[in-house]
């Protein structure tokens, strides 16, 4: 905290300009009027104040707006945003996408900080849902943003917003998140033709149920192994050898390299060995010929 000292004669700031970078912290505190600062916030970002000087300017704004800054000030915070704590940001009411973009720009190139996470949370909650424009903006700055949300939060994403999602935005999503996103993607892309549809839906298939995978196997999609390995194990297990062969097309040969990894390993254990042998890949571990397979889960459902 800067000591309260009288402003030296002739140093009272009449406007926010470059001359202030030569002020010591105590001079900024004593000579810059908080109301003047608030009305000329748009100038602050263009002036190369040190981070220590920015601390003083923040302190002045905090005193002027103890309940939280108005959006007219927030929009022009610029580098001063880096000085805000999550507690500061929780007091704000940010409604404009332009304000959000301006603040994300300041943090560009850095990982998502607690401040940015709080800002986004406040913004999205204020809007009530994660609309397409917001999602476009957030994933442009933070490709991993979508996967940082809980399944509950993802449920507020309207299907129309899915068009903004790029494959890399889903890289770090876990199966529970894809379970929520997949039906939205299916709805969003439903009017596309086969090959175009597959290109768009491919990144979301980690949330696809068995029946959708069976349907895809009838469409000559040639799914790559990387996508196949991300499918839900419970969705893959009921697929027949013929269905997997159709689903993967020429990529089926890659199963051999993955035979010890899920979901391939568990799928192999569920197939008849003679069916696996038809692939000619040397996959081992299937059910030997002559064995009867009882599906106990089906039996329990019937009783």
């Amino acid at each position: 905290e800067v000591e309260k000292t009288a402003c030296p004669s002739g140093k009272k700031a009449r406007e926010i300009d470059e001359s202030l970078i030569f002020y010591k912290k105590w001079e900024l505190e004593a000579c810059v009027d908080a109301a003047l600062l608030a009305t000329q916030m748009d100038r602050v970002n263009a002036i190369p104040f040190t981070y220590e000087q920015l601390d003083v300017l923040k302190h002045k704004l905090d005193e002027l707006y103890p309940q939280g800054y108005p959006e007219s000030v927030i929009q022009h915070l610029g580098y001063l945003f880096l000085k805000m704590s999550p507690e500061d940001i929780r007091k704000w009411n940010v409604t404009s996408l332009e304000t959000l973009k301006a603040l994300l720009e300041v943090n560009k190139g850095h990982e998502m900080s607690p401040q940015v996470a709080t800002l986004i949370d406040r913004f999205v909650k204020g809007r009530g849902q994660l609309d397409k424009d917001t999602l476009d903006t957030l994933t442009a700055f933070y490709p991993g943003y979508l996967c940082s949300l809980s399944p509950e939060e993802l449920s507020s994403v309207p299907p129309s917003s899915i068009w903004a999602v790029r494959p890399q935005d889903l890289d770090t999503c876990d199966p529970r998140q894809l379970d929520v996103l997949y039906p939205k993607a299916r709805l969003a892309f439903q009017n596309m033709n086969g090959s175009e549809y597959f290109v768009k839906i491919q990144s979301f298939l980690g949330g696809a149920p068995t029946e959708d995978l069976k349907a895809l196997s009838q469409q000559n999609v040639s799914m790559d192994l990387a996508t196949f390995m991300k499918l839900r194990t419970d969705a893959v297990l009921p697929l027949t050898v013929a269905e997997v062969q159709k689903l993967l097309g020429p990529h089926v040969e890659g199963l051999k390299a993955e035979e010890r990894h899920r979901p391939v390993r568990d799928w192999i254990l569920r197939q008849r060995q003679d069916d696996l042998d038809t692939l000619g890949l040397g996959l081992q571990g299937g059910i030997p010929n002559g064995y009867l397979v009882l599906d106990l889960s089906m039996q329990e459902a019937l009783s």
């Epitope: 970078i21 190369p48 104040f49 040190t50 981070y51 220590e52 000087q53 920015l54 580098y79």
Partner: nanobody, 115 residues
């Protein structure tokens, strides 16, 4: 990686002259606004002088008329010519790109002015 190496400091008597140098690497020097900061023992960081990429200069009131900032783009070097030195000029002097917003930090070069 941005690197700034200051030199030229030393001990002098009141009224004497020193020239500080700051050699830069790791960024486009001639596009950058540069500044000299100083910090006296027990005092806070203070900006002494700036020079913008177009060559315009500014000074703190306390050094106006005594200090001159200049740069040599060919050598990636910014200078601070200090004349009529006073005891209150005693400090560690550091140069910075103004965009870094860091101020007094790092090694710097020590200037001691004794009466």
């Amino acid at each position: 990686e941005v690197q700034l190496v200051e030199s030229g400091g030393g001990s002098v008597q009141v009224g004497e002259t020193l020239r500080l140098s700051c050699t830069a690497s790791g960024f486009t020097f001639d596009d950058s606004d540069m500044g000299w900061y100083r910090q006296a023992p027990g005092d806070e960081c203070e900006l002494v002088s700036t020079i913008s990429s177009d060559g315009s200069t500014n000074y703190a009131d306390s050094v106006k008329g005594r200090f001159t900032i200049s740069q040599d783009n060919a050598k990636n070097t910014v200078y601070l010519q200090m004349t009529s030195l006073k005891p209150e000029d005693t400090a560690i002097y550091s140069c910075r790109t103004m965009a870094s917003r860091i101020g007094c930090w790092g090694q710097g070069t020590l200037v001691t002015v004794s009466s």
